[in-house]
């Protein structure tokens, strides 16, 4: 008997969907495996006799639920298949936004970049995909545990009246109000504000 | 929400002509992929031609030749031009769509898209 593939799952970020799985202790020699999904109630092969233990998924609908399954292989015996369900826009991972942060003065001005569609030529980002995108900016003091959360109506935002000669750190991630679903937080950009630009009386 | 609805169907004698449209309303028309399907009666749904937003399209190798697909951005309409019809051509052909996408792939599999309109008949006689 052949083993079946083994912690079968799908790493699915911003629509790039790979399936994955382990090979499977087998003494007789390598293993290869197939991967299939189900289309209008015939499985089609994605992956054939492949000695890699991944197979990318990206084509398929973002919007239909998908059964997929794999299984392994050696000269003319097989596994039984191991399946997996996945709807790619429910299950799919935000990944973090771009974020371009600029030091004017007393103020840090941000501008939020959605990610990209991961597995599409073209521009079209993860907030065309999702009607509710919106974005969670969470900001604080350099050294403090204390931290404020905002949420920008528009693709940039300004914090103003910042204590002057401070260094800020600030990250962002999307959010989809309708699905109580957050994505990855970016990678924080610290920067330092210069001085309060109130002219004294 | 997207919605699509196939027109054009009907009936024809072999080595005819057809032009099936497909309406779509929805999201940004530019966006989609789109394709055409058909299925006749006890066999499963195949892939006949698509276009990507990008304008590549891809066709069955059974239409190839017989067949072209083209959309109009500005009317949010899918074309297809079936001439040279053929007894086997005879099916339920259904319009397909699935939005923000591009070229990439073939985009001839029903498990591509996500809508679907509710079909129309072709019927080619000997």
């Known amino acids: 008997m052949v083993p079946p593939p083994e912690n079968v799952r799908m790493n699915s970020v911003n629509f790039k969907n790979i399936l994955q799985w382990e090979s499977p202790a087998f003494a007789k020699g390598n293993l290869t495996f197939t991967a299939q999904y189900l289309s209008y109630r015939i499985f089609q092969d994605k992956c054939m006799n492949t000695t890699l233990t991944e197979c990318d998924f990206s084509s398929l609908s973002k919007y239909g639920d998908h059964t997929l399954r794999v299984r392994a292989e050696f000269a003319d015996e097989h596994s039984d298949w191991v399946n997996i369900t996945f709807c790619p826009v429910d299950d799919t991972i935000i990944g973090p936004p771009g974020m371009q942060v600029e030091v004017l003065a007393d103020s840090l001005h941000m501008r939020f970049l959605a990610p990209k569609i991961e597995n599409e030529y073209e521009t079209w980002t993860m907030k065309n995909v999702y009607n509710s995108w919106t974005y969670n900016v969470q900001y604080w003091k350099n050294g403090t545990d204390e931290k404020f959360q905002i949420t920008p109506q528009y693709d940039f935002e300004v914090l103003r009246n910042l204590e002057p000669w401070t260094t800020y750190c600030v990250q962002v991630r999307g959010f989809l109000p309708d699905r109580n679903k957050a994505g990855e937080w970016s990678e924080p950009v610290c920067e330092q504000t210069t001085h309060d630009e109130t002219v004294p009386s | 929400q997207v919605q699509l609805q196939e027109s054009g169907g009907g009936s024809v004698q072999a080595g005819g002509s057809l032009r099936l449209s497909c309406a779509a309303s929805?999201?940004?028309?530019?966006?989609?992929?789109m394709g055409w399907f058909r299925q006749a009666p006890g066999k499963e749904r195949e892939g006949v031609a698509a276009?990507?937003?990008?304008?590549?399209?891809s066709y069955a190798d059974s239409v190839k030749g017989r067949f072209a697909i083209s959309k109009d951005n500005a009317k949010n309409t899918l074309y297809l031009q079936m001439a040279s019809l053929k007894p086997e051509d005879t099916a339920m052909y259904y319009c397909?769509?699935?939005?923000?996408?591009?070229?990439?792939?073939?985009?001839?599999?029903?498990?591509?898209?996500?809508?679907w309109g509710q079909g129309t008949q072709v019927t080619v006689s000997s």
């Open positions: 276009i990507a937003s990008d304008g590549s399209t």
């Open positions: 397909a769509a699935e939005p923000w996408c591009t070229g990439g792939y073939s985009r001839l599999t029903p498990a591509e898209y996500g809508y």
């Open positions: 929805g999201y940004s028309y530019s966006s989609y992929c």
